[in-house]
């Protein structure tokens, strides 16, 4: 019955059985509900925005990581609807820092002004170098946890076609 | 191999009415959403209404609301419009189409059928 | 509603051309954009869906992108079959609209 059905599945009524709910492709994020023994008749998968990714399944759009704005990265490779964008080496004016555990947004480059002595990257960078990259606000830059990470916004889909 | 084929057309008088049907074979009709789509003479294209699979949702294009009733009969595998108070501008060929099974578009299109307003 | 103004709204190109279509839509609709082509017999046949998806079945040299508002269909190396009306269509929000439609001939 309903109620026995998992996360993503919905109560078949001509087999009596729990059924999965059917998995959207790359690129793409579930509209409507399926899951826990219901699933909406017009139940389907829509395409990814712009700046978001999937891949697939059950899961939702979520935006590319932002490798300038946010890790002070240069884009190694864009993110398109079905992955997300790779990060390449810092941006002039900014440095990795070494031996430090990986957090949940990966390496992130942190300013030459925070720097010591000698970092490589910074060794010949312009003295005084902007903490903000050029598009972002006059504050410094953001620590890693501050950055709102998950994106939850709907599609704005209204259903058919 | 997915065939959907519309019926129904024909000549009618302003503010008379008619009923297109659209018979589908090759799939689980049951299974699927369903669209009428129309073309006027020379014109482009212009969706008119939606039924969902079991007919539990059903939208209409503004110029068409409540004049115009999808309906569909899934034990006949038919989907049916059922059109009054016609006007010249109603004056099209109509389409039948079918939605992807998960997906938002019209996946596969019926040869379509003539309606002709006119007195 | 949202409008979807195509254009060329006709275009007379040769055999083994890139043909380039576009679509721009009145508002963003989030890559819900299909491209439909319509044969002189009336047929109409799904080509991309979802902006950049080729429908099963169909040959390579179509091909979709664009996002946001700004969107194209590209033909490469144009067929004879090829002749017939493209339209452009939004999925993201009702009513569904189409495209004028771009009226292809051969040169």
């Known amino acids: 019955e309903y109620s026995n059905c998992g996360e993503n599945e919905y109560y078949n009524q001509t087999t009596g059985l729990c059924q999965e709910c059917p998995p959207c492709g790359p690129g793409e994020e579930p509209y409507l509900s399926c899951g826990y023994g219901t699933k909406d008749e017009d139940y389907g998968c829509v395409p990814c925005p712009a700046e978001k990714f999937s891949k697939g399944g059950y899961q939702i759009c979520r935006r590319h990581k932002d490798c300038e704005g946010f890790f002070r990265a240069t884009v190694l490779t864009p993110g398109d609807m079905e992955n997300d964008a790779e990060c390449g080496p810092c941006l002039p004016g900014y440095y990795m820092l070494e031996n430090r555990p990986r957090n949940i947004y990966g390496m992130v480059c942190y300013s030459c002004l925070l720097a010591p002595p000698n970092t490589k990257e910074c060794v010949g960078a312009t003295s005084g170098a902007s903490a903000n990259f050029p598009g972002t606000s006059g504050s410094s830059t953001l620590s890693p946890f501050q950055h709102a990470h998950k994106e939850l916004s709907g599609q704005g889909h209204l259903a058919t076609a | 191999e997915v065939k959907l084929e519309e019926s129904g057309g024909g000549l009618v008088k302003p503010g008379g009415s008619r009923k297109l049907s659209c018979a589908a074979s090759g799939f689980t009709f049951s299974d699927y959403g369903m669209h009428w789509v129309r073309q006027a003479p020379e014109k482009g294209l212009e969706w008119v209404a939606y039924i969902s699979s079991g007919s539990s949702t059903i939208y209409y294009a503004d110029t068409v609301k409540g004049r115009f009733t999808i309906s569909r009969d899934n034990a006949k595998n038919t989907l049916f419009l059922q059109m009054t108070s016609l006007r010249s501008e109603d004056t099209a060929m109509y389409y039948c189409?079918?939605?992807?099974?998960?997906?938002?578009?019209?996946?596969?299109w019926g040869q379509g059928t003539t309606l002709t307003v006119s007195s | 509603d949202i409008v979807m103004t195509q254009s060329p709204s006709s275009l007379s190109a040769s055999l083994g051309d890139r043909v380039t279509i576009s679509c721009r839509a009145s508002?963003?609709?989030?890559?819900?954009l299909n491209w439909y082509q319509q044969k002189p017999d009336g047929t109409v046949k799904l080509l991309i869906y979802?902006?950049?998806r080729l429908h099963s079945g169909l040959p390579s040299r179509f091909s979709g992108s664009g996002s946001g508002t700004d969107y194209s269909l590209t033909i490469s190396n144009l067929e004879q079959e090829d002749i017939a009306t493209y339209f452009c269509?939004?999925?993201?929000?009702?009513?569904?609209?189409f495209g004028g439609g771009t009226k292809l001939e051969i040169k």
């Open positions: 189409a079918r939605r992807e099974l998960l997906r938002y578009y019209f996946e596969y």
């Open positions: 269509q939004q999925g993201n929000t009702l009513p569904y609209t």
């Open positions: 979802y902006t950049s």
């Open positions: 508002q963003d609709i989030s890559n819900h």
